[in-house]
Interface confidence: medium
Amino acid sequence: AELFLIASPSHPTEGSPVTLTCKMPFLQSSDAQFQFCFFRDTRALGPGWSSSPKLQIAAMWKEDTGSYWCEAQTMASKVLRSRRSQINVHRVPVADVSLETQPPGGQVMEGDRLVLICSVAMGTGDITFLWYKGAVGLNLQSKTQRSLTAEYEIPSVRESDAEQYYCVAENGYGPSPSGLVSITVRIPVSRPILMLRAPRAQAAVEDVLELHCEALRGSPPILYWFYHEDITLGSRSAPSGGGASFNLSLTEEHSGNYSCEANNGLGAQRSEAVTLNFTVPTGARSNHLTS
């Protein structure tokens, strides 16, 4: 009696199952008097000797490439051996690499968590994922795993993390890069500082007083509101960041507390109040303003 080993499929792709069947063309293999054993190179596979002429391998990998055969043993201990069958496990090269962000859109608040998710549409086996920062490619991290996606996490985003990023996937056939993804770090405004600028050391009535408000940190555009006591004087926008000014033609009623507020949609901050007082110097005929 002759024994044959049949692998189905005969050219498996990595990660896919394979069924090995020990065929006995001239005998009933279902007959309980036979025991079967499957081998790869010199090593027995699965449960060892079994009454089943089939062995199911759940997932084949590149390193499972090798020479396979089976043996059948009768009750009388006579062992039949099949010829060796070469099974080559096929690896699919990585293709269509993409980089996505969590949160989506690549906009993240300073201090929040950013995840860069590298994915491949195709590829089998151990895939090495590498993340790079900037078009020149500062290598941030690499991970090797048997999956089509991998993640790189920045737990607390800083302003310096605002950059272009890309990832590369490789499983032995050459690296495949993703496109560039731009990360924008959104920074809430810091507490603004209000400065008063007069044309001379002691401003007089009808002088123009400049109220200058500036938040030293914060993503543009920033909208500044100016207040006298709790009355809104007006607003100014700083589309590219920096400060903004509001001009006031002084009258005696302009004594009191001034403040400003900065708002960039990520939160509002109000400055400390600055007090203006009109003083009448002894022997002087005009009123003067001090702060």
Epitope: N88, H90, P93, T128, V168, E170, G172, G174, P175
Partner: antibody, heavy 117, light 112 residues
Framework: QVQLVQSGAELVKPGASVKVSCKAS????????MHWVKQAPGQGLEWIGR????????KYNEKFKSKATLTVDKSTSTAYMELSSLRSEDTAVYYC??????????WGQGTLVTVSS | DIVMTQSPDSLAVSLGERATINCKSS????????????LAWYQQKPGQPPKLLIY???TRESGVPDRFSGSGSGTDFTLTISSLQAEDVAVYYC????????FGQGTKVEIK
């Protein structure tokens, strides 16, 4: 431009070892797997093994498993192949080669290793 | 191992004529999952390392003259030099990378 520059020719005695180097430049070293190929005088090409410079993981042709050891030094973008217990049949030109799109797209100039007493 | 067999072992062709080299693999190099043939062709001149000409059986490497073309699928492949030039005198190798790489024995191309 991409360059793989190998160390010079070696004359070694039987039983000795030799370490061939392959310095890569012009590309990101850790991104491309490096393979090594043997060419005996007047003969064809024979694959020895490969190494992933990023992880240091290597795979060998069964025939060269006890003959060759592949390593890398990421800091200098250099791949190494050490050949041990040398015999006359190890006399050959040894090439390092980078793999891209499955194929070997850039090759070193080759290192001739001559084993002779 | 996958065995690669080239034919002929050597070939003499007149300048400007077509040269054809065949390569046969012991098992299919075409995979339905991505419809790619895992085969490359190389040119090697004396004293030089091999040079990649074709990959994925028919994709020409950048900088390679268009007189070089690759064709075939499954187990049978062909490298064609449409009009042989003096600088094409070399040994040509096919190589599979479906599994751990193996090369054909080489075909020497000379001028008749």
């Amino acid at each position: 431009q991409v360059q793989l520059v190998q160390s010079g020719a070696e004359l070694v005695k039987p039983g000795a070892s030799v370490k061939v180097s392959c310095k890569a430049s012009g590309y990101t070293f850790t991104r491309y797997w490096m393979h090594w190929v043997k060419q005996a005088p007047g003969q064809g090409l024979e694959w020895i093994g490969r190494i992933d410079p990023n992880s240091g993981g290597s795979k060998y042709n069964e025939k060269f498993k006890s003959k060759a050891t592949l390593t890398v030094d990421k800091s200098t973008s250099t791949a190494y192949m050490e050949l041990s217990s040398l015999r006359s049949e190890d006399t050959a030109v040894y090439y390092c080669t980078r793999v891209n799109s499955g194929a070997m797209d850039y090759w070193g100039q080759g290192t001739l290793v001559t084993v002779s007493s | 191992d996958i065995v690669m067999t080239q034919s002929p072992d050597s070939l003499a062709v007149s300048l400007g004529e077509r040269a054809t080299i065949n390569c046969k693999s012991s098992q299919s190099l075409l995979y339905s999952s991505n419809q790619k043939n895992y085969l490359a062709w190389y040119q090697q001149k004396p004293g030089q390392p091999p040079k990649l000409l074709i990959y994925w059986a028919s994709t020409r490497e950048s900088g390679v003259p268009d007189r070089f073309s690759g064709s075939g699928s499954g187990t049978d492949f062909t490298l064609t030099i449409s009009s042989l030039q003096a600088e094409d005198v070399a040994v040509y190798y096919c190589q599979q990378y479906s599994n751990y790489p193996t090369f054909g024995q080489g075909t020497k191309v000379e001028i008749k």
